[in-house]
Amino acid sequence: VPPYGSENQTCRDQEKEYYEPRHRICCSRCPPGTYVSAKCSRSRDTVCATCAENSYNEHWNYLTICQLCRPCDPVMGLEEIAPCTSKRKTQCRCQPGMFCAAWALECTHCELLSDCPPGTEAELKDEVGKGNNHCVPCKAGHFQNTSSPSARCQPHTRCEDQGLVEAAPGTAQSDTTCRNPSESLPPEMSGTMLM
């Protein structure tokens, strides 16, 4: 149990203890949410105190202060997903429609996702906001007719499901055009449905 002497400058529990060179002893670190209010000596272990409101320490530590809580920066495109507590900093992520463009231990700057052109859609990512859009072509039988960062390819309309016949096949950028079976289709007419 700390404090105890250590000649080789290492402690038994690296996570919860630290080496104090002045006295050549191992002392307890303070748990998350606390800081060192009195340093250890040969006869007394570290004394810890709870972080004040609006401050935190995330790890077992031998810090003499707690870190100040900071809000996520909306100017940098960040939004909050979880508040700061005495044991963790504010948790941030990119706002919807944005991705992380600058990373330094955590995301510091988000930018707008690129549009995917007609005929394509953004490849689904494991984690939202992690990277810019990678646009992939619509699979067979699907279309997407806008330039958008988030539009998804939709299945072509099946004319027969509506009691209609196909006037023009769908493409990656456009839906199938349907018409009434009784109508003959003049070549210049277009549109998704001709009635």
Epitope: G33, E53, N54, P71, D73, P74, E80, I81, A82, P83, T85, S86, Q91
Partner: antibody, heavy 116, light 107 residues
Framework: QVQLVQSGAEVKKPGSSVKVSCKAS????????LHWVRQAPGQGLEWMGW????????QYNEKFKGRVTITADKSTSTAYMELSSLRSEDTAVYYC?????????WGQGTTVTVSS | DIQMTQSPSSLSASVGDRVTITCKAS??????VAWYQQKPGKAPKSLIS???YRYSGVPSRFSGSGSGTDFTLTISSLQPEDFATYFC?????????FGQGTKVEIK
Amino acid sequence: QVQLVQSGAEVKKPGSSVKVSCKASGYTFTTYYLHWVRQAPGQGLEWMGWIYPGNVHAQYNEKFKGRVTITADKSTSTAYMELSSLRSEDTAVYYCARSWEGFPYWGQGTTVTVSS
Amino acid sequence: DIQMTQSPSSLSASVGDRVTITCKASQNVGINVAWYQQKPGKAPKSLISSASYRYSGVPSRFSGSGSGTDFTLTISSLQPEDFATYFCQQYDTYPFTFGQGTKVEIK
């Protein structure tokens, strides 16, 4: 000591808007989040959103997005919650609360009645 | 959103009784849970934060425990002034959510 003093009761018509104020004192207004929580008659508590007066940025519960606006005036240490397109289900007591690991400090509440 | 399921919704007890209220989160919220007491016509009053930390001025008969998804508020010996409604709340992630409340009534 920390105090949050809210504006008085309001009676509003359906479709109109209401703006409730919350004047803070006893602490540095710009360094703490102020939240709004409501409670319908005989019901539980429902979190609406917060404002961080330091940068006047607000974040909202998706349920209220587009209908609620939370603002703050640093010069008077006052936060405001405006709710628009009121309906009868918005009849409730609206509370402001200062957060730190929950809500240690609450305003006294403002009763908003929506009735035609 | 994280659901906080509180039970029981109401209970009848006598002065001196030990009362236990439970709250179950729909997903892990660590110890980021607070408990409140509310009396009719009044704002909620903070009792507990970080699942078990009792606010200064709150009598020692109130205690909180739990972590992850299961939390408990215990009143060791119910006093006349404790008859009220109690709410749990998670502040682990937005949107913050509350339990539906437990009304403690006089038997």
